[in-house]
């Protein structure tokens, strides 16, 4: 008996042929021996089945000797049996009709977990087969579950059905919904304009929820809430903001906020939260702020940073074009008694400048000037 | 009998870009995944990439910057495009069909050699 | 990447003798472990996929085995036409190869 696998929503056509190259009487039935279409003569007849409006022939191909059976929008209950009676012989083909699903919607938060769900005929034993958008392989059976869904877990996965040596393929088009960096540094000099953008790795028609960002200043004992945001079909309408800092935010996507100026005392990490419309869970965004500061007080240079630096970050302070004459890994680097001149606080990682802020200090009769 | 032919210039200068092409007999490239391998003067052997049924790609990570697999189904064929070559490209380029999607290639082309020089 | 190493990589066997060749993987591989066989005139065989599953046309006297790391093809009555270098190659993630274990006649 001939195995033909079929996808749910699919056309397939199981065939059939005499050895006479001819038009000639010919039925289709399924395994109960109702019957679902044949000819009389030129004509397409169709029986009492369930198929009835589904089923189709190609009488173009009759005069060839091939009768096939075309069966639209296919069903899981379609699996069957089916016969083909021409020329007093009976040929037989088992049809097999499987589906694939992503068991919940196709958008999920990331680090959600992603169930892919098969549909089968009683009595088959198929595996799946599934690769995923950067190319990891899974097996399962009747499900398979994805744990912990990452950004790069989002695009087509594409899944093999295997079954009695046969198969039948399937994509599946999974958007994770996140935000495209976990994590984000801001580097400012006191003062400075301060701009923290939180781009979607993602792209949808209609996107609506809330969001807040809590910030974490180094030098407070706790958080608390800098401003609190709804997204109307990606418009952006600020809710509530703090007094200090004053916040500003912008009224389109990708979200993006606004501190007039980065001063120490806001130097620490914040947390971004948006909590989308019909979804369980949140998107996060860490975002850090590291504020640097150059002052001369009487014989004192000296160079202050504030906020999350790791340890393997080196802060220096040198005078233009000469060696740096002091550097650690510290948060505060000074020197006393410092030459006229120009100097730079340097803030860098493996010799990479994040952070640079120049002074100009005068002779010893005059005052510092700060460019 | 299924059968994979790759074709393509067998000398490539250096700093050009490799491009050879697969030609599957016997089986459609709309159905499973085909790849590309080379294999080394030492029998060493590396995967390039795939593109599969539903014309999804995905490449060797130490590569992803200078390879590129596109498909034709009117012709039945699937290319490999390696920008940027060096002497260190020099090898036996593969073609390959993973029927199932284990990344089992049940069936290899007779590999074509290439050489990068100038 | 996930490494995998070919703990031989020659030997020499009798013929009619059983013979294994191992591969230890860098990490869990669930089960992704497929083998090869590279013949002198350059072609390349697909024999054992998912570790132990025999490739159609594959004679019976090629198996496989292994689960987590550790996976071995074995070679249960060697024949003349065997002579050939094995690989194994894992297929969790995007492939890499093992390095290659060359198989000779005593």
């Known amino acids: 008996k001939k195995v033909v696998l079929g996808k749910k929503g699919d056309t397939v056509e199981l065939t059939c042929t005499a050895s006479q190259k001819k038009s000639i009487q010919f039925h289709w039935k399924n395994s109960n021996q109702i019957k679902i279409l044949g000819n009389q003569g030129s004509f397409l007849t169709k029986g009492p089945s369930k198929l009835n409006d589904r089923a189709d022939s190609r009488r173009s191909l009759w005069d060839q000797g091939n009768f096939p059976l075309i069966i639209k929008n296919l069903k899981i209950e379609d699996s069957d049996t089916y016969i083909c009676e021409v020329e007093d012989q009976k040929e037989e083909v088992q049809l097999l009709v499987f589906g694939l699903t992503a068991n919940s919607d196709t958008h999920l938060l990331q680090g959600q977990s992603l169930t892919l769900t098969l549909e089968s005929p009683p009595g088959s034993s198929p595996s799946v087969q599934c690769r995923s958008p950067r190319g990891k392989n899974i097996q399962g059976g009747k499900t398979l579950s994805v744990s912990q869904l990452e950004l790069q877990d989002s695009g087509t996965w594409t899944c093999t059905v295997l079954q009695n040596q046969k198969k039948v393929e399937f994509k599946i088009d999974i958007v994770v919904l996140a935000f495209q960096k976990a994590s984000s540094i801001v580097y400012k000099k006191e003062g400075e304009q301060v701009e923290f953008s939180f781009p979607l790795a993602f792209t949808v028609e209609k996107l609506t929820g809330s969001g807040e960002l809590w910030w974490q200043a180094e030098r407070a004992s706790s958080s608390k809430s800098w401003i609190t945001f709804d997204l109307k079909n990606k418009e952006v309408s600020v809710k509530r903001v703090t007094q200090d800092p004053k916040l500003q935010m912008g009224k389109k996507l990708p979200l993006h906020l606004t501190l007039p100026q980065a001063l120490p005392q806001y130097a620490g990490s914040g947390n971004l939260t948006l909590a989308l419309e019909a979804k369980t869970g949140k998107l996060h965004q860490e975002v850090n702020l590291v504020v640097m500061r150059a002052t001369q007080l009487q014989k004192n240079l000296t160079c202050e940073v504030w906020g999350p630096t790791s340890p393997k970050l080196m802060l220096s302070l040198k005078l233009e074009n000469k060696e740096a004459k002091v550097s650690k890994r510290e948060k505060a680097v000074w020197v006393l008694n410092p030459e006229a001149g120009m100097w730079q606080c340097l803030l860098s990682d493996s010799g990479q400048v994040l952070l640079e802020s120049n002074i100009k200090v005068l002779p010893t009769w005059s005052t510092p000037v700060q460019p | 009998e299924v059968q994979l032919q790759e074709s393509g210039p067998s000398l490539v200068k250096p700093s050009q870009t490799l491009s050879l092409t697969c030609s599957v007999t016997?089986?459609?490239?709309?159905?499973?995944?085909w790849n590309w391998i080379r294999k080394f003067p030492g029998h060493k052997l590396e995967f390039l990439g795939y593109?599969?049924?539903?014309?999804?790609?995905n490449y060797n990570p130490s590569l992803k910057s200078r390879v590129s697999i596109t498909r034709d189904t009117s012709k039945n064929q699937f290319d490999l495009q390696l920008k940027s070559v060096t002497t260190e490209d020099t090898a036996t380029y593969h073609c390959?069909?993973?029927?199932?999607?284990?990344?089992?290639?049940?069936?290899w082309g007779q590999g074509i050699s290439v050489t990068v020089s100038s | 990447d996930i490494h995998l190493t070919q703990t031989t990589s020659s030997l020499s066997a009798s013929l009619g003798d059983r013979v294994t060749i191992i591969c230890r993987a860098s990490?869990?591989?669930?089960?992704?472990l497929n083998w090869y066989q590279l013949k002198p005139d350059g072609t390349l065989k697909l024999l054992i996929y998912?570790?132990?599953r025999l490739h159609s046309g594959v004679p019976s006297r090629f198996s496989g085995s292994g689960s987590g790391t550790e996976y071995s093809l074995t070679i249960s009555n060697l024949e003349r036409e065997d002579v050939a270098t094995y690989f194994c190659?894992?297929?969790?993630?995007?492939?890499?190869f093992g390095a290659g274990t060359k198989l000779e006649l005593k």
């Open positions: 390959a069909r993973d029927d199932y999607g284990y990344y089992a290639m049940d069936y």
């Open positions: 016997g089986d459609s490239i709309t159905s499973g995944y």
């Open positions: 593109i599969s049924f539903a014309d999804t790609t």
């Open positions: 990490q869990d591989i669930d089960n992704y």
């Open positions: 998912y570790t132990s």
């Open positions: 190659q894992q297929g969790n993630t995007l492939p890499t």
